[in-house]
């Protein structure tokens, strides 16, 4: 029998996807895992093994279908089940009743690009990836910028509370090397949370004209 | 709804071998459990070899431990069944099976199935 505190942690990108995390103090690295879901209302179920990623968590991602393929609704209660082999037999070692749309974490935003850059300033756009149209506009989005000398955790958060995207970064140095990165959320869910930072776009600011002010 | 087509069967003399290959399309391949499963002549279909979405996980049935393997390429959509030292009794069709859900995989009603592939050993 495995004992010690367990965390059974999953969220929904709003699509096809349910990404699953399960924490277990003193669980064996070489136990065969899956976590099982069972919607109330869907005729399917769906499985995924759950992969060490580290000394004793383990996650899995259920993958519900097409990438951009609505199957869950805001009405759907899902049973999410570990279970783990032991021996011949299965064990249930968490069990949740998981409401879809309360738990969301979106994926990460995509097609960061430049859409103008001068000496002091930049306007940035970038694409929202696998979500649901049910949001319609109620998605907020945190941004931030590196720069040269500092550390992403200590770099300030633009919130742009509202679907917006794109932003126009000021006061910026001429002739800098900078990085950008985004997140997003929707307004929806009770234990909804931010989605990963997107890759970082790395862009310079143009030097500033010869013999001008700056 | 997803499809499943077997290749590599054929004749083979005892102690043999044979890869069979399913190739899985119109749907997302890493969402299913797959499984081989075989039915030799006047027999039930019977379990062979299964592999997990991730494929960190096999099993097989007692009688082809340590002969077969099984084994998936998720950027291929294809499962694959390597098998050794092949004896007689290892004729049958060879079916390949996809379930979304790893606890139902070994239930016949429950999958969805490719048309078979023949493998033949000979004496």
């Known amino acids: 029998a495995v004992n010690g505190t367990s965390q059974f942690t999953c969220f929904y990108n709003s699509r096809a996807n349910i990404s699953c995390v399960w924490s277990q103090d003193g669980a064996l690295q070489d136990t065969s895992c899956q976590v099982h879901a069972w919607p109330d209302r869907r005729r399917w179920n769906q499985t995924c093994e759950l992969l060490p990623v580290s000394q004793a968590s383990w996650a899995c991602n259920l993958i519900l279908g097409a990438p951009d393929s609505q199957k869950l609704t805001t009405v759907d209660i899902v049973t999410l089940r570990v279970l783990c082999r032991e021996g011949v037999r299965w064990r249930v070692m968490a069990i949740q009743d998981f409401k879809p749309f309360e738990n969301l974490r979106l994926m990460a935003p995509i097609s960061l690009q430049v859409v103008h850059v001068e000496t002091h300033r930049c306007n940035i756009s970038w694409e929202i990836s696998q979500a649901s149209h049910y949001f319609e506009r109620h998605l907020e989005f945190e941004a931030r910028t590196l720069s040269p000398g500092h550390t992403w955790e200590e770099a300030p958060l633009l919130t742009l509370k509202q679907k917006q995207e794109w932003i126009c970064l000021e006061t910026l140095t001429p002739d800098t090397q900078y990085e950008f990165q985004v997140r997003v959320k929707p307004l929806q869910g009770e234990f909804t949370t931010w989605s990963p930072w997107s890759q970082p776009l790395a862009f310079r600011t143009k030097p500033a004209a010869l013999g001008k002010d700056t | 709804e997803v499809q499943l087509v077997e290749s590599g069967g054929g004749l083979v003399q005892a102690g043999g071998s044979l890869r069979l290959s399913c190739t899985v399309s119109?749907?997302?391949?890493?969402?299913?459990?797959m499984a081989w499963f075989r039915q030799a002549p006047g027999k039930e279909r019977e379990f062979v070899a299964t592999?997990?979405?991730?494929?960190?996980?096999?099993e097989y049935v007692d009688s082809v431990k340590g002969r077969f393997t099984v084994s998936r390429d998720n950027a291929k959509n294809t499962v694959y069944l390597q098998m050794n030292n092949l004896k007689p009794e290892d004729t049958a069709v060879y079916y390949c099976?996809?379930?979304?859900?790893?606890?139902?995989?070994?239930?016949?009603?429950?999958?969805?199935w490719g048309q078979g592939t023949q493998v033949t050993v000979s004496s």
């Open positions: 119109g749907d997302v391949f890493v969402r299913y459990t």
């Open positions: 592999v997990t979405d991730s494929g960190r996980t096999t």
């Open positions: 099976a996809a379930n979304t859900d790893y606890f139902r995989i070994r239930s016949l009603d429950a999958n969805t």
